[in-house]
């Protein structure tokens, strides 16, 4: 908390310039009025100012506006935006999209902040839904704010939006969220070459179905094990070995390390056991040779 | 087929800045990441940055925030980085390239000398 | 950020001789997005291996590229003259996408 003291004579500020660089924070207290301050808060990003003296103009900020600050000001805080905490953002109303990218502009490059976090949650309650335009705008900042969405609030994601997203973007999505995006992605690398599309599509193909996997089998891809164990089980329990000797390629030799695991476990129990003996990997649990197989899923449908 | 064609070598004075471009044809220039890289005489490749012109999402190499502007005009399916308040360190070879899962295709460079 | 470091920094080999040259991330990339280009003096870079293993089109055979986590490698089973030229590792895994420093293939 900064003392009240009287501006000394001649030091008051007319305008927000650089010449309040050199004032110390106990005049800049004194002498910035805090309602100049909130009109000409397009100036301040502009000139370099301290932390201490940015702490110094949030408080008069504060002290203007108790209640939360007005969106015409909230546009123009550029890095003071860094200054603020959640509980001041909880109480701001934002509606214009202008002012969010305003602010994720300043936060850019960086880790989606809890600042930043409680922005979108305010922003996006105050418009009611989440529309194509902020979808677009938060999927280029934070392509990772994908997976922080439910499958419904997915299913409005444009596949345009998709060639933004990295993989490191979708360590947190979980399967019903990829069986949302992947044929999304689909759709958005569907001109791109073989090699290119299996790369752009591994990180999504934890929502792809067994069809694509059988397709993806007959094209030299080499899958690599982690990519193998993100599949869903479902989809990967009807492929035979030689489908995924022919998707893993060289990288077959990694099931063995797998063997307990998931689907790799489940997929090797539907497997007969001298299917699994060509591999040579010595992967055991397979259904012993002479052994029928029903489907016991097959029988309840007919009866 | 794919073709990246860069502008022409450019001379400029300290504290200038300079505005290349990078001219797309031979796919939908939209769907792929336009990525920028600085090789200077006898050094390695260093990223910049890159821009998606199909939303205008870009990002930028922390090192040339505030250095590097990227923009695009789909119009005429051109990539452009503006370089601000030159300096001899950013004397250099400029490449621009397309990025599906790699840099698939590259410019031929544009040299940008800065010299008093 | 992902450093990766190369080494050697510049090598000379004898015609026919086999080459090795490495590529080492500060952390894990990924297979799939570890890349190596060539570059030969007053050209740009060619996108030479893609996903560590996979030749890029028009790449003679002799060329192969192997490894995993944090450690790559390009070798070439019998160097030739045209395989002279710089060559440069990249990941494209995690944002800011990083190159290594060269590794500068000179013939002895």
């Known amino acids: 908390e900064v003392e009240k003291t009287a501006c000394p004579s001649g030091k008051k500020a007319r305008e927000i310039d650089e010449s309040l660089i050199f004032y110390k924070k106990w005049e800049l207290e004194a002498c910035v009025d805090a309602a100049l301050l909130a009109t000409q808060m397009d100036r301040v990003n502009a000139i370099p100012f301290t932390y201490e003296q940015l702490d110094v103009l949030k408080h008069k900020l504060d002290e203007l506006y108790p209640q939360g600050y007005p969106e015409s000001v909230i546009q123009h805080l550029g890095y003071l935006f860094l200054k603020m905490s959640p509980e001041d953002i909880r109480k701001w109303n934002v509606t214009s999209l202008e002012t969010l990218k305003a602010l994720l502009e300043v936060n850019k490059g960086h880790e989606m902040s809890p600042q930043v976090a409680t922005l979108i949650d305010r922003f996006v309650k105050g418009r009611g839904q989440l529309d194509k335009d902020t979808l677009d705008t938060l999927t280029a900042f934070y392509p990772g704010y994908l997976c922080s969405l439910s499958p419904e609030e997915l299913s409005s994601v444009p596949p345009s939006s998709i060639w933004a997203v990295r993989p490191q973007d979708l360590d947190t999505c979980d399967p019903r969220q990829l069986d949302v995006l992947y044929p999304k992605a689909r759709l958005a690398f569907q001109n791109m070459n073989g090699s290119e599309y299996f790369v752009k599509i591994q990180s999504f193909l934890g929502g792809a179905p067994t069809e694509d996997l059988k397709a993806l089998s007959q094209q030299n891809v080499s899958m690599d094990l982690a990519t193998f164990m993100k599949l869903r089980t479902d989809a990967v329990l009807p492929l035979t070995v030689a489908e995924v000797q022919k998707l893993l390629g060289p990288h077959v030799e990694g099931l063995k390390a797998e063997e307990r695991h998931r689907p790799v476990r489940d997929w090797i129990l539907r497997q007969r056991q001298d299917d699994l003996d060509t591999l040579g990997l010595g992967l055991q649990g397979g259904i012993p040779n002479g052994y029928l197989v029903l489907d016991l899923s097959m029988q309840e449908a007919l009866s | 087929q794919v073709q990246l064609q860069q502008s022409g070598a450019e001379l400029m004075k300290p504290g200038a800045s300079v505005k290349l471009s990078c001219k797309a044809t031979g796919y939908t220039f939209t769907g792929y990441w336009i990525e920028w890289v600085k090789q200077r005489p006898g050094h390695g490749l260093e990223w910049i940055g890159e821009?998606?012109?199909?939303?205008?999402?870009?990002n930028y190499n922390e090192k040339f925030k505030g250095k590097a502007t990227f923009t695009a005009d789909t119009s005429s399916n051109t990539a452009y980085m503006q370089l601000s308040s030159l300096t001899t360190e950013d004397s250099a070879i400029y490449y621009c390239?397309?990025?599906?899962?790699?840099?698939?295709?590259w410019g031929q460079g544009t040299l940008v000398t800065v010299s008093a | 950020q992902i450093v990766l470091t190369q080494s050697p920094a510049i090598m000379s080999a004898s015609l026919g001789e086999r080459v090795t040259m490495t590529c080492t991330a500060s952390?894990?990339?990924?297979?799939?997005?570890l890349h190596w280009y060539q570059q030969k003096p007053g050209s740009s870079p060619k996108l030479w291996t893609y996903s560590t293993s996979n030749l890029a089109s028009g790449v003679p055979a002799r060329f192969s590229g192997s490894g995993s986590g944090t450690s790559y490698s390009l070798t070439i089973s019998s160097m030739e003259a045209e395989d002279a030229a710089t060559y440069y590792c990249?990941?494209?895994?995690?944002?800011?996408?990083?190159f290594g420093g060269g590794t500068k293939l000179e013939i002895k």
């Open positions: 990249h990941q494209y895994h995690r944002s800011p996408w990083t």
């Open positions: 390239a397309r990025a599906g899962a790699w840099f698939a295709y």
């Open positions: 952390s894990s990339v990924s297979s799939s997005y």
């Open positions: 821009i998606l012109p199909g939303s205008g999402s870009t």
